[in-house]
Interface confidence: low
Amino acid sequence: EAHKSEIAHRFNDLGEGHFKGLVLITLSQHLQKSPFEEHVKLVNEVTDFAKACVADESAQNCGKAIATLFGDKVCAIPSLRETYGELADCCAKEDPDRVECFLQHKDDNPNLPPFERPEPEALCTAFKENNDRFIGHYLYEVSRRHPYFYAPELLYYAEKYKNALTECCEAADKAACLTPKLDAIKEKALVSSAQQRLKCASLQKFGERAFKAWSVARLSQKFPKAEFAEISTIVTSLTKVTKECCHGDLLECADDRQELAKYMCEHQDSISSKLKECCVKPTLQKAHCILEIQRDELPTELPDLAVDFVEDKEVCKNFAEAKDVFLGTFLYEYSRRHPEYSIGMLLRIAKGYEAKLEKCCAEADPHACYAKVFDELQPLIDEPKKLVQQNCELFDKLGEYGFQNALAVRYTQKAPQVSTPTLVEYARKLGSVGTKCCSLPETERLSCTENYLALILNRLCILHEKTPVSERVTKCCTESLVNRRPCFSALHVDETYVPKPFHADSFTFHADICTLPEKEKQVKKQMALVELVKHKPKASEEQMKTVMGDFAAFLKKCCDADNKEACFTEDGPKLVAKCQATLA
């Protein structure tokens, strides 16, 4: 139904607390450099305005679209141009162009210091002084670093954060109580951020059809007892919610998400028995619980897929008459039967099936042409299975750090034009997938690995789009969302790359490395490894092993020496010369 005042409607639906949180997230995600105090001032102004509209929906400006109200607020900031440069040019545009323009200026990699966690004592003091302000600060700091974070989920994490502090700040050992809780929240929130970023990229770069296909596969795996019509209904609502959040319409998104959760709880009998435990929870927890829900058991006696999709004489007729519905049904039926497959695999299989029908249904004897379609799709299942097996074996053999090094070499050879810090960051992220997934049972390994890789490669693609340096990366990132991972896997040494000249600086170390925390020490060594590969992309595994061994021995020797700096100064150049000789 249409409301006289959209902002009043959302304020009433969401309540003041959530409304303020969402306004703060909206502003922080768009104006990532502004200080917290400036945002608080704007949040209070928007909230006061919304309250005035609740009192009188016909009051001045209350009828305006929420995006227009936000845009007007942003464009009224006096220091906008000096702080944000060309973002201020958006203000010369009319909505909806202005909204699009703001979106294009969101920075996925803002130049902000890492979000450091203060000591437990300091945390608790600040929290006790003013817990609303403290939680507001958390929303602000996360939002400006993650401008596509799923806003209603961020409210959930803020609530978890608040609960952890409420409990632990009363504990005798605050650190022992807080550290594991906050670590867990941080890890989950980072994954949540990456998941939402992939959804937004899917919508923005590949369109609604790609996102809907992704959603059908995921929901069919989770709710295998639900009918296709039910899955389709949920997917339609979910697409609307996701589009709103990705577009920065966070109040609408959060409100519609509440509605979707309510709908699913009202129809839980026809969706999943697992919804029961979620539906008794309060709003934020309910929606989060549904998002994270365990998959339902498979219905018994499911007929063989071939019955409807190969043997049925009407296959081509059904395909021609309602292509998307027929392919959607195929994806639904295949996904609900294969909870152990990754989303990417399921979508590649559906794509393969579609391509086969496109070809066969134009032939004289379609059935003879597509009769062996499932056999022909088998490589799409075997390739990732084999890849996961090989990589997990390598991970088991080398451990996380050694596995990261192997990946650093591999990815530098694939895309040597990418900057060294970026290659190290991604090798480390890809390496940690081994830790997350390789210890899982066989049935979960495959989906865990590919689904995580999709998140990591998406981040790589987003940052590479900002400053592209490798056509091969651009090609893998833009040609097909579902084929990104196979495309990267298929890349080998870039034969066209001109090796980087040898810079002794890249391999010069000082005594300060000895006192660095282990993680930072690893990063330094991995930077040198990547530089080495850029210098000699075709070096053999043996040569690399020798150089890395010499390098480790050099670090150990000098870090154990009495006069560390003298050791680094004297032995460093010798090591460099030795490495050059090894790689010559």
Epitope: Q417, T467, P468, V469, S470, T496, V498
Partner: nanobody
Framework: DVQLVESGGGVVQPGGSLRLSCAAS????????MSWVRQAPGKGPEWVSS????????LYADSVKGRFTISRDNSKNTLYLQMNSLRPEDTATYYC????????SGQGTLVTVSS
């Protein structure tokens, strides 16, 4: 189709200067980092310098640092290399490339430094 056309090469005395240009077309110029790569007669290709899509980040090989300056004019889809204090060892064919890939380069422009 991607096209890169280098110009500005020639014969110059040691210590002299030249400015190379590279006109680009067939792709979104602002979206790609660009590089200059050179190849001396009878030698392998050598990377010289790179610049990011926006022009804010630049990188130079040690052999040219302080003498060469890479720049770009995104409104003209053109990449430049200002070469000062030229030496005989700078004699080579200079190619402009997308990223650092020789597979995406022009025909090159010959620079000869000789007295």
């Amino acid at each position: 189709d991607v096209q890169l056309v280098e110009s500005g090469g020639g014969v110059v005395q040691p210590g002299g200067s030249l400015r190379l240009s590279c006109a680009a077309s067939g792709f979104t110029f602002t979206s790609f980092g660009m590089s200059w790569v050179r190849q001396a007669p009878g030698k392998g290709p050598e990377w010289v310098s790179s610049i990011s899509g926006s022009g804010s980040d630049t990188l130079y090989a040690d052999s040219v640092k302080g003498r060469f300056t890479i720049s770009r004019d995104n409104s003209k889809n053109t990449l430049y290399l200002q070469m000062n204090s030229l030496r005989p060892e700078d004699t080579a064919t200079y190619y402009c490339t997308i990223g650092g890939s020789l597979s995406r380069s022009g025909q090159g422009t010959l620079v000869t430094v000789s007295s």
